[in-house]
């Protein structure tokens, strides 16, 4: 006999990275017929919602009107059908951005390279932070973590056309409080690759430095969010 229900999906709209003082909605999608949803923040009960009528609703929203550093952290949700509770959702890392200062991002040897060339990003911020984050924009975005007193290096290694895209970096004051984003840097990778094994669909990065986020930068991408797990996997876990 089933003791728990399947875990719900949790995500943030419009994004898990929320500028301070801006609004964000945490969405939790379970099953039709769920009579109660609970949102937990850093392991403690944060909010409860009881959808009406439960048989016609499979998703609830928890609205945060004014994002700040106290609201940033790890969220999860559970739901109940009758007396049976679900497994907890994956953890959603909600990050507050636009804190304090703006880093500068540069790329060597330059923003336009040939496939196979080694590329390194540099994120610099002169204020008190020792951790930096490099993000590539897009639905399947990758976040790389780097360390340094005022600057962090992000070596991508030999690049392929899959590395093309727009990059930004942040200084991180703690796990969930990030600086303003840098100005974007667009990396262009040209050149036909003879050895197609060098061109994966997505860049692969060392497991110890990369966490994968499935991001949605558009609010209306998909109504059926069960198709997508928009959970931000905790980069620092």
């Amino acid at each position: 006999q089933q003791q728990t229900l399947p875990k719900p999906f949790i995500w943030a709209e419009p994004h898990f990275m929320v500028p301070k003082e801006k609004q964000v909605t945490i969405c939790c999608q379970g099953n039709y017929g769920a009579v109660e949803y609970q949102l937990h923040f850093e392991g403690s009960l944060f909010a409860v919602d009881r959808p009406k009528p439960p048989e016609r609703i499979n998703k609830v929203q928890f609205y945060i009107p004014d994002m700040n550093s106290r609201m940033a952290g790890q969220y999860s949700c559970i739901y109940r059908v009758g007396e049976l509770w679900s497994e907890p959702s994956n953890l959603l890392d909600l990050v507050v951005t636009e804190m304090y200062d703006t880093p500068t991002l540069s790329v060597h040897p330059g923003p336009e390279v040939i496939s196979g060339e080694k590329v390194t990003f540099y994120c610099r911020l002169d204020t008190a932070t020792s951790m930096f984050l490099l993000l590539k924009e897009g639905r399947s975005s990758h976040v790389q973590r780097g360390y340094g007193k005022v600057q962090a290096e992000f070596p991508l290694g030999p690049v392929t056309t899959a590395h093309r895209g727009t990059y930004r970096c942040f200084g991180s004051y703690n796990n969930h409080a990030w600086s303003f984003p840098s100005e974007p840097v667009k990396l262009l990778v040209t050149g036909d690759i003879e050895n197609t094994s060098l061109a994966p669909e997505d860049p692969t990065f060392p497991a110890d430095t990369w966490g994968t986020y499935l991001l949605t930068t558009e609010t209306g991408l998909q109504k059926d969010h069960a198709l997508w797990d928009h959970t931000a996997q905790n980069l620092l876990r």
Partner: antibody
């Protein structure tokens, strides 16, 4: 010591082709892209194109579209530029130059003088 | 294509002079600007990378500044061996482009 040794001067007839070589030593050939730069007599420098020995990926200056083909031989750590349909306009000194991934063209060959004349 | 222009075309100097060579890009290239020196019958040599960063083995009298589209190479006390042509290079976008050069000569 990093060295880029280019092939000797060439005197060729219009309409023919020529293949210039750039033999490298002193570093890992596949880690740096190799670029070719043209310098006509008394003129500035013009980037012809570049190749990544690691992947075989190339990028060409569209101004010289179809004029050159860049290749490498990894076994001998040598880069090549083949120029075709030569005219007197192609008479120049051609340099190979290594593009460092933390700067620009940090090492250059000594240049190969190409003269196209009937 | 990004067009690089340099001024002056020729600069006549006396040893010990402090000189400034100008380079302008047709659009912003941030700090992706490199300077080269080419002496007569020699290959070019990298002097300054990323607008202002020094290169190992290059005398400290050479320095660079600027960002965006306006850049300057300075030689704070010219030596006779500095005679040659100085080129700036766009390292931002393909095609990589060079300026027409500034010829430095002795008076």
């Amino acid at each position: 010591e990093v060295q880029l040794q280019q092939s000797g001067p060439e005197l060729v007839k219009p309409g023919t082709s020529v293949k210039i070589s750039c033999k490298t030593s002193g570093y890992t050939f596949t880690e740096y892209s190799m670029h070719w730069v043209k310098q006509s007599h008394g003129k500035s420098l013009e980037w012809f194109g570049g190749i990544s020995p690691n992947s075989g990926g190339t990028s060409y200056n569209q101004k010289f579209k179809g004029k050159a083909t860049l290749t490498v031989d990894k076994s001998s750590s040598t880069a090549y530029m083949e120029l075709r349909s030569l005219t007197s306009e192609d008479s120049a000194v051609y340099y190979c130059a290594r593009r460092d991934f933390h700067s620009s063209f940090d090492y250059w060959g000594q240049g190969t003088t190409l003269t196209v004349s009937s | 294509d990004i067009v690089m222009t340099q001024s002056p075309a020729t600069l006549s100097v006396t040893p010990g002079d402090r000189v400034s060579l100008s380079c302008r890009a047709s659009q912003s290239i941030s700090d992706y600007l490199h300077w080269f020196q080419q002496k007569s019958h020699e290959s070019p040599r990298l002097l300054i990378k990323y607008a202002s960063q020094s290169i190992s083995g290059i005398p400290s009298r050479f320095s660079g500044s600027g960002s965006g589209s306006d850049f300057t190479l300075s030689i704070n006390s010219v030596e006779p061996e500095d005679v040659g042509v100085y080129y700036c290079q766009n390292g931002h976008s393909f095609p990589l482009t060079f300026g027409p050069g500034t010829k430095l000569e002795l008076k």
